[in-house]
Interface confidence: low
């Protein structure tokens, strides 16, 4: 919230890339170096993003739009902005607070991020499963045992289902 | 690291002029507004003005408006505050101190040491 | 020129207690306020700017709040390194004012 001083506040007229100087009689003054204001009207400009260590560059500050940032190989951004930069993992692993690990038996994780989630349980949905699952990849699901010819049935205990979100450490 | 140096106390006769020095170090002089406070023995605190070094771009409290004179020597990073026509309620501990560019952000981030101004005949 | 009127000008608190100083500004300054600790021989210390905005660095026992005349600042539980002078400050307009001071002491 800015208070209008006037019927007519001086720094309304500010555009974006300006700020509105209260040291220089409230004229509007461009950003300086490495600070910019997407809005006019602003009284300050706001510091640049900027993009260091594991966080590269993806679009450069101007004086009316901030740096936009994403992450250097081998990890992956999180949160709005890509305010965090997170620890790639292989495919078959999760990140957990020490480091990346396997997928337990029973869930899978088809990406470098994220965490191992439970195999498709196919007898939920009164069918067999076709494709055994692995570290990486569900299990996929076929017809149901009573459309298979006798024997031809692979049977593979399902998983017990782990709660979304839980991540084992 | 960001320091400001402030020139040795002075003891001054009423009438007279001082002339006192901060010498900034440890960042770049030009980008930071360079603001003088006052404070009198047992008393608050008081601004008197301010200078943008880039362009010695000044403002004055107008209290102190035609007694002070702000400037500054860009090639040693050094502001001087001169206060001519000193009288006994000049006595003061003197501070430099530096704010950045964002009026309406202001923090004074950095102090001088201050130095002690005595009027007296 | 803006008055800021601050209050008290000094109290005593024992240590861990809650202690809270305010500061009246003449008009309305938005959120343009900062507050200063002062210790004896030293240089003034920033501790909250815009009214509300922790400095680097300062024990988060320092708050500020408050917008347009009226502001509080409060030290949720006083430590012996607390005992200082401290001081408001506005700058929405020029000149800045500094307020009276608040001596805080130990009791």
């Known amino acids: 919230f800015e208070r209008t001083r006037s019927l007519q506040d001086p720094c309304s007229n500010c555009p974006a890339g300006t700020f509105c100087d209260n040291n220089r009689n409230q004229i509007c003054s461009p950003c300086p170096p490495n600070s910019f204001s997407s809005a006019g009207g602003q009284r300050t400009c706001d510091i640049c993003r900027q993009c260091k260590g594991v966080f590269r560059t993806r679009k450069e500050c101007s004086s009316t739009s901030n740096a936009e940032c994403d992450c250097t190989p081998g990890f992956h951004c999180l949160g709005a902005g890509c305010s965090m930069c997170e620890q790639d993992c292989k495919q078959g692993q999760e990140l957990t607070k020490k480091g990346c690990k396997d997928c337990c038996f029973g869930t899978f994780n088809d990406q470098k991020r994220g965490i191992c989630r439970p195999w498709t349980n196919c007898s939920l949905d009164g069918k067999s499963v076709l494709v055994n699952g692995t570290k990486e990849r569900d299990v996929v699901c076929g017809p149901s045992p009573a459309d298979l010819s006798p024997g031809a049935s692979s049977v593979t205990p399902p998983a017990p289902a782990r709660e979304p979100g839980h991540s084992p450490q | 690291q960001v320091q400001l140096v402030q020139s040795g106390a002075e003891v001054k006769k009423p009438g007279s002029s001082v002339k006192l020095s901060c010498k900034a170090s440890?960042?770049?002089?030009?980008?930071?507004?360079i603001n003088w406070v006052r404070q009198a023995p047992g008393q608050g605190l008081e601004w008197m003005g301010n200078i943008y070094p880039s362009d010695s771009y000044t403002n004055y409290n107008q209290k102190f408006k035609d007694r002070v004179t702000l400037t500054v020597d860009k090639s040693t990073s050094t502001a001087y505050m001169e206060l001519s026509s000193l009288r006994s309620e000049d006595t003061a501990v003197y501070y430099c101190?530096?704010?950045?560019?964002?009026?309406?952000?202001?923090?004074?981030?950095?102090w001088g040491q201050g130095t002690l101004v005595t009027v007296s005949s | 020129d803006i008055q800021m009127t601050q209050s008290p000008s000094s109290l005593s608190a024992s240590l861990g207690e809650r202690v809270t100083i305010t500061c009246k500004a003449s008009?309305?300054?938005?959120?343009?306020l900062s507050w200063f600790q002062q210790k004896p021989g030293k240089a003034p210390k920033t501790l909250i700017y815009?009214?509300?905005r922790l400095v680097d660095g300062v024990p988060s026992r320092f708050s500020g709040s408050g917008s347009g005349q009226d502001f509080t600042l409060t030290i949720s539980s006083l430590q012996p390194e607390d005992i200082a002078t401290y001081y408001c400050l506005q700058y929405d307009e020029l000149p800045p004012t500094f307020g009276g001071g608040t001596k805080v002491e130990i009791k």
């Open positions: 440890g960042y770049t002089f030009s980008s930071y507004w």
């Open positions: 008009q309305d300054i938005n959120s343009y």
């Open positions: 815009r009214a509300n």
């Open positions: 101190t530096r704010t950045w560019e964002f009026y309406y952000d202001s923090v004074f981030d950095y």
